[in-house]
């Protein structure tokens, strides 16, 4: 299976070939395609843990209520239909920390 | 049609910053990841970096990683590359590349003209 | 780093000839290549990703296979056009790596 930070580069053979995110994206792995990293920010959130190749960010609210903390996604690096394709804002700022890399291959 | 203008040439002193824009048009801007790629004089290419404008997620090449630093501007659909502490190996054709957008695939579909950095004392 | 050695690092070649250039990969990069064709002066443009899929535009006379090391971009019929410098690149793990080109020159 495509570890942590990569993802299937043929569906119908996951796991034998296994590419890394592009950049700002992540997959925790398990042959998941990668996801573009939410943007707390833009959110109007707080960063609690900043997105990696492998995890997404974790956003909470700036007066956090009792509640879990809240994830937002947006689009993918290409319109490919297996990644979301819920639209941001124009204004997004990104991340102030990089990824760790996670060398891609199969697990 | 899509398309990525590179800013003209640059000559710099060593240890000095260059900082190289690409203005993508013809394509939503955000959507795709923008990457950098060189080329030394009658040189092969070399991979930088790649940004994802959406949210300003970069990956570096880990010999430039303490030197480069990528940026997006998606109100100008503008990438930037700027890098420090020049040095004469630097000197180079730098291009800007966005990513296919066939699938997970990893190579680059569309480039900039290329902007010549010359690094010289 | 996975380096990605070609062969020849160039070629004399006639018009109507077919033409083979090979590339090998240090480890197994599965079928994620690319291959490029730039001309002196000018940006590479894409010919085949994913070892063997033209893309868009691209000639029929290019086609391109293998996988795991070894691959080969083939030019079934040289067109004056052509004469120019073949790279070939994995993206199976960063840093991505191109090979150290081709150069295929008129006889």
């Known amino acids: 299976r495509c570890r942590a930070g990569t993802q299937p580069l043929d569906s119908y053979k996951p796991g034998v070939d296994c590419a890394p995110c592009p950049p700002g994206h992540f997959s925790p792995g398990d042959n998941q395609a990668c996801k573009p990293w939410t943007n707390c920010t833009l959110a109007g959130k707080h960063t609690l843990q900043p997105a990696s190749n492998s995890s997404d960010a974790i956003c909470e609210d700036r007066d956090p209520p009792a509640t879990q903390p809240q994830e937002t996604q947006g689009p993918p690096a290409r319109p490919i239909t297996v990644q979301p394709t819920e639209a941001w804002p124009r204004t997004s700022q990104g991340p102030s920390t990089r990824p760790v890399e996670v060398p891609g291959g199969r697990a | 049609q899509v398309q990525l203008v590179q800013s003209g040439a640059e000559v710099k002193k060593p240890g000095s910053s260059v900082k190289v824009s690409c203005k993508a048009s013809g394509y939503t801007f955000k959507d795709y990841t923008m990457h950098w790629v060189r080329q030394a004089p009658g040189q092969g290419l070399e991979w930088i970096g790649g940004i994802y404008p959406n949210n300003g997620g970069s990956t570096y090449n880990q010999n430039f990683k303490d030197r480069v630093t990528l940026t997006a501007d998606k109100s100008t659909s503008t990438a930037y590359m700027e890098l420090s502490s020049l040095r004469s190996e630097d000197t180079a054709v730098y291009y800007c590349a966005r990513m296919g957008y066939h699938g997970p695939h990893l190579d680059f579909d569309v480039w900039g003209q290329g902007t010549t950095v010359t690094v010289s004392s | 780093d996975i380096q990605m050695t070609q062969s020849p690092s160039s070629l004399s070649a006639s018009v109507g000839d077919r033409v083979t250039i090979t590339c090998k990969a240090s480890?197994?990069?599965?079928?994620?290549v690319a291959w490029y064709q730039q001309k002196p002066g000018k940006a590479p443009k894409l010919l085949i990703y994913w070892a063997s899929t033209r893309h868009t535009g691209v000639p029929s006379r290019f086609s391109g296979s293998g996988s795991g090391t070894d691959f080969t971009l083939t030019i079934s019929s040289l067109q004056p056009e052509d004469f120019a410098t073949y790279y070939c690149?994995?993206?199976?793990?960063?840093?991505?790596?191109f090979g150290g080109g081709t150069k295929v020159e008129i006889k």
């Open positions: 480890q197994d990069v599965g079928a994620a």
């Open positions: 690149q994995q993206y199976i793990n960063y840093p991505l790596t």
